[in-house]
């Protein structure tokens, strides 16, 4: 699987999850998030050669098409597969609120 | 929606579904598919600016991150959202077989 266990331990050029730390205030301008200051959102990148973690029959077909027609602009793209939530603390006035934001952390990638 | 109805009628530079005809024999080397000879598989391409048909909170965050950090390599990617099946005819020896291949035709895209 193209997950953090594999991708963070290997120098993988092809589609894999990459570490990306986002600081809410500095990177997004979100001053309203009090905790955490930032988090590892991660991201997916790298080429998607034929059959590499193909998401659907279409991505398999497109991968093969791209292999046999290298000049073609059509190819699968490396995108998030499994995502995890992130719990944040913020304030509404003087009242603290805790919320779980879904699909915030990329744990693995796929070719789609 | 970034679907064929919209994308095929507009000159859209950003993420959209694009027409792509694939000939099974010529483009994939699949001699075993007897009908159809080929089909419009289509594909997704184009930049994913902030908030454009964002698939998850992560793609929204990544889009904003990319907007505020233009030098960053991390950005959402334009990939298939809705896919449709394709019915094909092939032969096993002298016996004809009809099969519905799932997720073969891209009908719309998203930024993921």
């Amino acid at each position: 699987a193209l997950d953090t266990n594999y991708c963070f331990r290997n120098l993988e050029e092809n589609c894999c999850v990459r570490p990306l730390y986002i600081d809410f205030r500095q990177d997004l301008g979100w001053k309203w998030v009090h905790e955490p200051k930032g988090y590892y959102a991660n991201f997916c990148s790298g080429p998607c050669p034929y059959l590499r973690s193909a998401d659907t029959t279409h991505s398999t077909v497109l991968g093969l098409y791209n292999t046999l027609n290298p000049e073609a602009s059509a190819s699968p793209c490396c995108v998030p597969q499994d995502l995890e939530p992130l719990t944040i603390l913020y304030y509404v006035g003087r009242t603290p609120k805790v919320e779980q934001l879904s699909n915030m952390v990329v744990k693995s990638c796929k070719c789609s | 929606a970034l679907d064929t109805n919209y994308c095929f009628r507009n000159l859209e530079e950003n993420c959209c579904v694009r027409p792509l005809y694939i000939d099974f024999r010529q483009d994939l080397g699949w001699k075993w598919v007897h009908e159809p000879k080929g089909y419009y598989a289509n594909f997704c391409s184009g930049p994913c600016p902030y908030l454009r048909s964002a698939d998850t909170t992560h793609s929204t965050v990544l889009g904003l991150y990319n907007t505020l950090n233009p030098e960053a390599s991390a950005s959402p990617c334009c990939v298939p959202q809705d896919l449709e099946p394709l019915t094909i005819l092939y032969y096993v020896g002298r016996t004809p077989k009809v099969e519905q291949l799932s997720n073969m035709v891209v009908k719309s895209c998203k930024c993921s």
Epitope: - | K31, H34, T87, L89, Y91, R94, T95, P96
Partner: antibody, heavy 119, light 111 residues
């Protein structure tokens, strides 16, 4: 260009044997089923014998009229299909065509070879 | 085995005529939307030639005056304007199941 060249036809006495050969070129012989179709004088086309590719275990078919007397075989290394005809009868007199069916239709045909069974 | 019955068994026509030949199968030769019926032309001393495959698809190099239609058990070969070189015997053939069989043929003669 697809070419199918039959050979081996001729005059033979009832009860005798003949071996027809069909040398193929111009296509991926290994991938496709090959057939022998005959036309007896004044009659229509009849599929006599058929052999599919190695992918499908060289499965064979014979019409009832030739079963247990004719044997179809193929040599993929030589791109050749054969029809061994034993215990020949007068009613086997016909032009025998070698043909290839990539799908459900017989797309290409040889010129045919005449087999005459007569005393 | 699936039997194919062609009609008529022979016909006389003139150059320029529209000719229709039918082929009826003893059971359906269609599967899903695919119609597994094919048509051939056979002239004396020559090998048969594929005209139409899967009911309505024109084979490579065949003139557009030939067309095919039908589904299920009933199929038609049409020659829109008969030409001198079209006088021949025409056969249908199915590939719905093994064994594939041919129709008895339709001989098109000069009137």
């Amino acid at each position: 260009e697809v070419q199918l060249l039959e050979s081996g036809g001729g005059l033979v006495q009832p009860g005798g044997s003949l071996r027809l050969s069909c040398a193929a070129s111009g296509f991926d012989f290994n991938s496709y089923g090959m057939s022998w179709v005959r036309q007896a004088p004044g009659k229509g086309l009849e599929l006599v014998a058929d052999i599919v590719s190695k992918t499908y275990n060289y499965t064979t078919y014979y019409s009832d009229s030739v079963k247990d007397r004719f044997t179809i075989s193929r040599d993929d290394s030589k791109s050749t299909v054969y029809l061994q005809m034993n215990s020949l009868r007068a009613e086997d007199t016909a032009v025998y065509y070698c043909t290839v069916a990539p799908g459900g239709s017989f797309d290409y045909w040889g010129q045919g070879t005449l087999v005459t069974v007569s005393s | 085995d699936i039997q194919l019955t062609q009609s008529p068994s022979s016909l006389s026509a003139s150059v320029g005529d529209r000719v229709t030949i039918t082929c009826r199968a003893s059971q359906s030769v269609s599967i899903s939307r695919f119609n597994l019926m094919h048509w051939y032309q056979h002239k004396p001393g020559k090998q048969p030639k594929l005209l139409i495959y899967r009911a309505s698809n024109l084979a490579s190099g065949i003139p557009s005056r030939f067309s095919g239609s039908g589904s299920g058990t009933d199929f038609t070969l049409t020659i829109s304007s008969l030409q001198p070189e079209d006088f021949a015997t025409y056969y249908c053939q199915h590939s719905r199941e093994s064994p594939w069989t041919f129709g008895g043929g339709t001989k098109v003669e000069i009137k």
